[in-house]
């Protein structure tokens, strides 16, 4: 979390805004609130990044107001206009690209003052992983699956009754990439797995960690996965 | 939940003062406007102003700025609202409503003034 | 001050029509309107928001439209339990300023 204050003495507002990260290909949201004013005229919100010469987004006296805005950011951009009133400048950014990571800054002015805050957006690819048995194989194999991950991630394995082992030995990780030459497939296979115990397969890169369990008794496979960004920081 | 609680019924001389309060619950009070409206009877509203309580600062109606003064007790939570030398005209209901989600979005259920000699 | 008119006072109608009340703001508001429902001896409730956002848990037979200055608010199947005063309301400067109201009532 970062909080900015504004620089212009008593005049200063609280902003704050929360470092993110962005999935390449899907929308992603650059989270900033401020004190709220009480009426729409007076609210300008502009986003800027830096090393970008125009701007992100602007939006003044109740509307976006974009001559401003770089060619990059073109059409990719919006508010939360019905939330501005409450103090949301939170930004709404389209087809994240790899691109779009950097430093941010939420530049608020109202009646009350100006304030600033800067934010982290790191951009990549991260997906939900699925745990499921593999009947093709020879031995009692798992195999888990995560369609689209950038940077390359680790793959890890663990166990609940075989806690603390090393499962390096007995599985193989490959990366497939995908079809627009960024994002990876990523399929990691356990072998020699026992039944009456819960996998887990643990997927991480610096951006999101992500886990898929899958518990194997003579009666019934239950799974369950889960998705964690790794970098929500306030400022 | 949220919730806003007004002072009861008033019934005051002309040319007195009264204080109502507005004791917000259910969010964190000092972080949005709360608002204060007139409603006289068989009439419309009239917005008179708001207090944001996190730093104080207050916008008034200009007709009302010699007859309404806002405040705010943050370890309360409370909201409270001043008019003085009243008149037959100041016989209304007055509501205070906040603004957590949006534009006036949770509102008390009013304090009744009468004026009368 | 900017004045919103509300050029009907009252409007009749039946259970199962569709009504629609308009506002007319003396300047520009952009999409900085609510709309608000009064029954007689509660407060007002929020309905409408930024011109066209329904507030949570109104029922979808209520929806707002315009900007600028012309503004209207639509209820699509009156229930019996919408008869109310309606008012509009800008919030894009201040004094926050009301609508003289609508009242609804049935034929």
């Known amino acids: 979390l970062i909080i900015g204050f504004g620089i212009s003495g008593r005049h200063s507002i609280t902003v704050t805004t929360v470092a993110s990260a962005g999935n390449i290909g899907e929308d992603g949201i650059l989270s900033c609130t401020f004190e709220p004013d009480i009426k729409l005229s007076d609210i300008v919100i502009q986003w800027l990044k830096e090393g970008v010469l125009g701007l992100v987004h602007e939006f003044k006296e109740g509307k976006d107001e974009l001559s401003e805005q770089d060619e990059m950011f073109r059409g990719r951009t919006a508010v939360f206009a019905d939330q501005v009133i409450v103090g949301n400048a939170s930004l709404r950014l389209k087809n994240v690209q790899l691109t779009d990571a950097g430093t941010y800054k939420c530049y608020i002015i109202t009646s009350k003052g100006k304030g600033n805050a800067n934010l982290e957006y790191k951009t990549g690819a991260f997906s939900m992983p699925e745990v499921n048995v593999d009947y093709n194989a020879s031995s009692e194999t798992l195999r888990c699956e995560a369609p689209r991950w950038f940077p390359q991630p680790t793959v890890v394995w663990a166990s609940q009754v075989d806690q603390g082992a090393n499962f390096s030995e007995v599985s193989n990780t490959s990366f497939e990439l995908n079809s627009e030459n960024v994002t990876m497939k990523v399929v990691s296979v356990l072998y020699n797995v026992t039944i009456n115990n819960t996998y887990s397969c643990m997927i991480e890169n610096d951006i999101a960690k992500a886990t898929g369990d899958i518990k194997v008794t003579e009666s019934e496979i239950k799974r369950r996965s889960h998705l964690q960004l790794l970098n929500s920081k306030a400022s | 939940e949220v919730q806003l609680q007004q002072s009861g019924t008033v019934l005051a001389r002309p040319g007195a003062s009264v204080k109502m309060s507005c004791k917000a619950s259910?969010?964190?009070?000092?972080?949005?406007?709360m608002h204060w409206i007139k409603q006289r009877p068989g009439q419309g509203l009239e917005w008179i102003g708001a207090?944001?309580?996190?730093?104080?600062?207050?916008k008034y109606n200009q007709k009302f700025k010699d007859k309404a003064k806002l405040t705010a007790v943050t370890s309360a939570s409370t909201a409270y609202m001043e008019l003085s030398s009243l008149t037959n005209e100041d016989s209304a209901v007055y509501y205070c409503?906040?603004?957590?989600?949006?534009?006036?979005?949770?509102w008390g259920q009013g304090t009744s003034v009468t004026v009368s000699s | 001050d900017i004045v919103m008119t509300q050029s009907h006072k009252f409007m009749s109608t039946s259970v199962g029509d569709r009504v629609s009340i308009t506002c007319k703001a003396s300047?520009?508001?952009?999409?900085?309107v609510a709309w608000y429902q009064q029954k007689p001896g509660q407060s007002p409730k929020l309905l409408i928001y930024?011109?066209?956002y329904r507030y949570t848990g109104v029922p979808d037979r209520f929806t707002g439209s315009g900007s600028g200055t012309e503004f209207t608010f639509t209820i699509s199947s009156v229930q019996a339990e919408d008869l109310a005063v309606y008012y509009c309301?800008?919030?894009?400067?201040?004094?926050?300023?009301f609508g003289a109201g609508t009242k609804l009532e049935l034929k």
């Open positions: 409503t906040s603004t957590v989600r949006n534009v006036m979005d949770y």
């Open positions: 300047q520009d508001v952009r999409t900085a």
């Open positions: 259910g969010y964190t009070f000092t972080s949005y406007w």
């Open positions: 930024s011109t066209s």
């Open positions: 207090i944001y309580p996190g730093n104080s600062d207050t």
């Open positions: 309301q800008q919030y894009y400067v201040t004094p926050l300023t």
